[in-house]
Interface confidence: medium
C-alpha cells in the first residue's frame, strides 16, 4: 500500500498493529465499465485445450462459490476433432484474493487469503527431456 | 456465509447494516499448501496463443500489482512456428476482487471491488457468421 | 426490481426436446447463478442443476445428465434450459432461480423465482 | 443424495396456534433454507440459512437447527400463513427439497 499522512476523514484504527485490520465495505462496486465485457464464457467449448468448469462452494469464504477450470484432455485438439498427444493441454493458473471468515462463522470477521485457481487452459509444446 | 448463533469470540460491528462492513486481517495466509505449486510461468511463451505479461499499479488499490495477459497475435502459432489465421488467440479473463482504498489515501478502510483480468491466452476455432 | 420473466407454456410430444427461456432484469446478470427447479403436478420440487453467466459453468443433478444442456446468453441476460428425450413424466412446473456468487447483502440462496413455465407432454 | 424428511406432511391448524415443521437430512448439513408456496405461485425464499428471515418474512417465523435436525416455527399462526412449505440443502449434490408440509387453517 501506499504510506500517506492520515486524512481527517479517515476512520479511525484501533489496532496498534495498524493497518495489520482494516475495514472493509463488502459491497461491491464493479469496475467492469462495459455493462457487457467480453466474457470467456464459450471458450471452454471452442478452446484447442478445451475445459469443464467445476463449482466449488465453501461458506466460510467469500465468494463462497468459485468455478475451477479442469482441461479435458492430456493433449490439445485438432481441427479434425482428435486429440493430437503431441501437444499438451495445460491449465492456466491464477493467485486470488479470497476473504475466509476468522474466527470460523463469524459474520463480520476476515482474513485475507491467497488461492490458486484454475481459470482455463491452454494449448502448450511439450518440454521434451532427452536423456545423453 | 453462514449464519450461526454470533460466536463470543467475534468482533462486535458497529454497522447497523450489517455484515456490509467488515474487518479484515491483512495478515495474508496462503492456501497453496506446495511450497512450489506448478505454476503457468513459462507457458505464455511455449503456448499455441502465447501472451505478453503487462504491469499493471495502482496504489489506492490492493493488491497495487496486477499482471494482465495480452495475446501476441490474432491468430494461433502452428507448430512450423508460423500464425494460422484460421484460428483465434483470445484471452481467458476472470473477475478477480480487490481492495480499493475508500476514502482515497485511507490507510485502514477499503471497499470491495470486482475487476476483470485477462489471465492468459488460449487458442479458439472462430465462430463463422455465414451471410445468407 | 428484480425480475425473472419465463417463457410460455409448452405441449410436446415424448421424445422431443423443449427449450425454456429465462430473462433476468434488474440486477447484473453475471453476479448471480442461474439454478433450475421443477416441479411435477401435486409434487414437491426438484433441483436439475446451475450454470454461471460469467464462466458458463454447469452442474447437472446426475438424475438429468446427458438431457439436460444450460446455456445463457449475457448479451440479453437470458438463460436457457434445454431437455431433451422427454417423457411424459417430464410434465411439470419449470422454474428459473438466481442464487448469489458475491456479498453485500446476499442471502447465498435463491432469492428470486420466475414465474414458472408449464411442460406438459403427452401423445 | 442426501434424503431431507419433512414432518408432518400435513398440518390442520387454527389461528394463534404455534407450529412447528421439521426437517431431518439423511446425512449431516450445514445449514437449511426454507422457502413457501402458496397454490399456483412460485416458491419464496422464507428462511435462509437454518435463522435467518428472507425480507418481508413476519418475525413470527424463526428456524433453528443443526446437523441432521432442522425446524422452521411459527409463533402465532396467521390465515395468511395457509401454504406449502420446503427445506433445502445445498450441502452437497445434488441440491434436494424435502417433500413438504401443507398448513392448512381451519
Known amino acids: 500500500g501506499i504510506a500517506i499522512p492520515r486524512n481527517s476523514g479517515c476512520p479511525n484504527s484501533e489496532d496498534k498493529n495498524f493497518p495489520r485490520t482494516v475495514m472493509v465495505n463488502l459491497n461491491i462496486h464493479n469496475r467492469n465499465t462495459s455493462t457487457n465485457p467480453k466474457r470467456s464464457s464459450d471458450y471452454y467449448n471452442r478452446s484447442t485445450s478445451p475445459w469443464n468448469l467445476h463449482r466449488n462452494e465453501d461458506p466460510e469464504r467469500y465468494p463462497s462459490v468459485i468455478w475451477e477450470a479442469k482441461c479435458r484432455h492430456l493433449g490439445c485438439v485438432k481441427a479434425d476433432g482428435n486429440v493430437d498427444y503431441h501437444m499438451n493441454s495445460v491449465p492456466i493458473q491464477q493467485e486470488i484474493l479470497v476473504l475466509r471468515r476468522e474466527p470460523r462463522h463469524c459474520p463480520n470477521s476476515f482474513r485475507l487469503e491467497k488461492i490458486l485457481v484454475s481459470v482455463g487452459c491452454t494449448c502448450v509444446t511439450p518440454i521434451v527431456h532427452h536423456v545423453a | 456465509g453462514i449464519a450461526i448463533p454470533r460466536n463470543s469470540g467475534c468482533p462486535n460491528s458497529e454497522d447497523k447494516n450489517f455484515p456490509r462492513t467488515v474487518m479484515v486481517n491483512l495478515n495474508i495466509h496462503n492456501r497453496n499448501t506446495s511450497t512450489n505449486p506448478k505454476r503457468s510461468s513459462d507457458y505464455y511463451n511455449r503456448s499455441t496463443s502465447p501472451w505478453n505479461l503487462h504491469r499493471n499499479e495502482d496504489p489506492e488499490r490492493y493488491p497495487s500489482v496486477i499482471w494482465e495477459a495480452k495475446c501476441r497475435h490474432l491468430g494461433c502459432v502452428k507448430a512450423d512456428g508460423n500464425v494460422d489465421y484460421h484460428m483465434n488467440s483470445v484471452p481467458i479473463q476472470q473477475e478477480i476482487l480487490v481492495l480499493r482504498r475508500e476514502p482515497r489515501h485511507c490507510p485502514n478502510s477499503f471497499r470491495l471491488e470486482k475487476i476483470l483480468v485477462s489471465v492468459g491466452c488460449t487458442c479458439v476455432t472462430p465462430i463463422v457468421h455465414h451471410v445468407a | 426490481e428484480v425480475q425473472l420473466v419465463q417463457s410460455g407454456a409448452e405441449v410436446k410430444k415424448p421424445g422431443a426436446s423443449v427449450k425454456v427461456s429465462c430473462k433476468a432484469s434488474g440486477y447484473t446478470f453475471t453476479d448471480y447463478e442461474v439454478h433450475w427447479v421443477r416441479q411435477a403436478p401435486g409434487q414437491g420440487l426438484e433441483w436439475m442443476g446451475v450454470?454461471?453467466?460469467?464462466?458458463?459453468?454447469?452442474a447437472y443433478n446426475q438424475k438429468f445428465e446427458g438431457r439436460v444442456t444450460m446455456t445463457t446468453d449475457t448479451s440479453t441476460s437470458t438463460a436457457y434450459m434445454e431437455l431433451r428425450s422427454l417423457r411424459s413424466d417430464d410434465t411439470a412446473v419449470y422454474y428459473c432461480?438466481?442464487?448469489?456468487?458475491?456479498?453485500?447483502?446476499?442471502?447465498?440462496?435463491?432469492?428470486?423465482w420466475g414465474q414458472g413455465t408449464l411442460v406438459t407432454v403427452s401423445s | 443424495e442426501i434424503v431431507l424428511t419433512q414432518s408432518p406432511d400435513f398440518q390442520s391448524v387454527t389461528p394463534k396456534e404455534k407450529v412447528t415443521i421439521t426437517c431431518s437430512a439423511s446425512?449431516?448439513?450445514?445449514?437449511m433454507h426454507w422457502f413457501q408456496q402458496k397454490p399456483d405461485q412460485s416458491p419464496k425464499l422464507w428462511i435462509y440459512r437454518t435463522s435467518n428471515l428472507a425480507s418481508g418474512v413476519p418475525s413470527r417465523f424463526s428456524g433453528s437447527g443443526s446437523g441432521t435436525d432442522y425446524t422452521l416455527t411459527i409463533n402465532s399462526l396467521e390465515a395468511e400463513d395457509a401454504a406449502t412449505y420446503y427445506c433445502q440443502q445445498r450441502s452437497s449434490y445434488p441440491w434436494t427439497f424435502g417433500q413438504g408440509t401443507k398448513l392448512e387453517i381451519k
Open positions: 432461480t438466481r442464487y448469489s456468487l458475491f456479498y453485500g447483502s446476499s442471502p447465498y440462496a435463491m432469492d428470486y
Open positions: 450454470i454461471d453467466p460469467g464462466t458458463g459453468g454447469v
Open positions: 446425512s449431516s448439513v450445514n445449514y
